[in-house]
């Protein structure tokens, strides 16, 4: 039975040209996290594996940095980076947990972080 909950940074906004940290946290389970995959809509951005460490997709290497922790840092943001991001936690024995973050990249200098929220 999957009892865990993923907490994410929720709906966030950032300025064009800036950077942002995408962060998820799995709680309420004793399952072992074996791997976390980060996806942007239909693109695999990065993977953090408990044994192998980080793999950043080559096409994103210039603008994506691993961490902090199991999170992901996006740099040199463009308006095209606006959209949904997913953290997919592969765990044993529970299975897979998915968290969703919506990022809006703004042209203006007024970019405020949204509230954190939970996805069961």
């Amino acid at each position: 039975m999957m009892t865990g909950t993923i907490e994410t940074t929720g709906n966030i906004s950032a300025e064009k040209g800036g950077s942002i940290i995408l962060q998820c946290h799995l709680s309420s389970t004793t399952a072992q996290v074996t791997q976390v995959n980060w996806e942007q809509q239909d693109q695999l951005l990065a993977i953090c594996n408990a044994d192998l460490g980080w793999h950043i997709s080559p096409s994103f290497k210039d603008r994506v940095a691993p961490g902090p922790g199991l999170g992901l840092t996006l740099q040199s943001l463009t308006v095209n980076d606006t959209g949904e991001y997913f953290c997919i936690y592969h765990t044993y024995p529970d299975g897979t947990y998915t968290g969703r973050i919506f990022l809006e990249v703004l042209e203006s200098s007024v970019a405020e972080h949204g509230a954190r929220f939970q996805i069961p």
């Epitope: 074996t34 791997q35 996806e39 239909d42 693109q43 695999l44 993977i47 594996n49 044994d51 192998l52 793999h55 997709s57 096409s59 592969h90 044993y92 024995p93």
Partner: antibody, heavy 118, light 107 residues
């Protein structure tokens, strides 16, 4: 240099059993998921089974579920496939393949032929 | 199970030609799509992983694109050593599944 070397193939009668081995070298075997993939003569590739790095989790194709068992011995850097209740349709070349991040298979062995026939 | 449909099943081409092979998934697989090359009597060789990432040591004339359900493998200028069978494979979910293969033959 990464190397995967399968062994254990051969001729077996329907209903019989066979155990395939895959000896790994040139990388930290215990850090990688591993797969068995097979190819019937003149046919395409068919995934058979997967085992996670620690051996804690396995998955199988429906066609072999309940008959085949994938396992590993990380102290011996060896992957296994125990095949029971073999059928004619199991006749194929069996490859072991390394599966980094469970997303792709980057190194393959040369394969071992299993023939199920009376 | 996710079905992978490759087309064409075979094609004839000449050295220097641009060759395109397509692969369609029966449901969205994000970018969890790999391409392999296989020559007769040999093990498959990884060319492209995660839809568009070129495997180390693979010539840059090979490229992959697509996401969701539709994917393409392109060989920009076919070389003599490229005549082989090419397979796509999804790793979005188990059971892992392969396309039926595309045999690239000499015209």
């Amino acid at each position: 240099e990464v190397q995967l070397l399968e062994s254990g193939g051969g001729l077996v009668q329907p209903g019989g059993s066979l155990r395939l081995s895959c000896a790994a070298s040139g990388f930290t075997f215990s850090s990688y998921s591993m797969n068995w993939v097979r190819q019937a003569p003149g046919k395409g590739l068919e995934w058979v089974a997967n085992i996670k790095s620690s051996g804690s989790s396995t998955s199988y194709a429906d066609s072999v579920k309940g008959r085949f068992t994938i396992s590993r011995d990380n102290s011996k850097n060896t992957l296994y496939l125990q095949m029971n209740s073999l059928r004619a349709e199991d006749t194929a070349v069996y490859y072991c393949a390394r599966g980094p991040y469970d997303v792709w298979m980057d190194y393959w062995g040369q394969g071992t032929l299993v023939t199920v026939s009376s | 199970d996710i079905q992978m449909t490759q087309s064409p099943s075979s094609l004839s081409a000449s050295v220097g030609d641009r060759v395109t092979i397509t692969c369609r998934a029966s449901q969205s697989i994000s970018s969890y799509l790999n391409w392999y090359q296989q020559k007769p009597g040999k093990a498959p060789k990884l060319l492209i992983y995660a839809a568009s990432s070129l495997q180390s040591g693979v010539p840059s004339r090979f490229s992959g694109s697509g996401s969701g359900t539709d994917f393409t493998l392109t060989i920009s200028s076919l070389q003599p050593e490229d005549f082989a069978t090419y397979y796509c494979q999804q790793s979005y979910s188990t059971p892992l599944t392969f396309g039926g293969g595309t045999k690239v033959e000499i015209k």
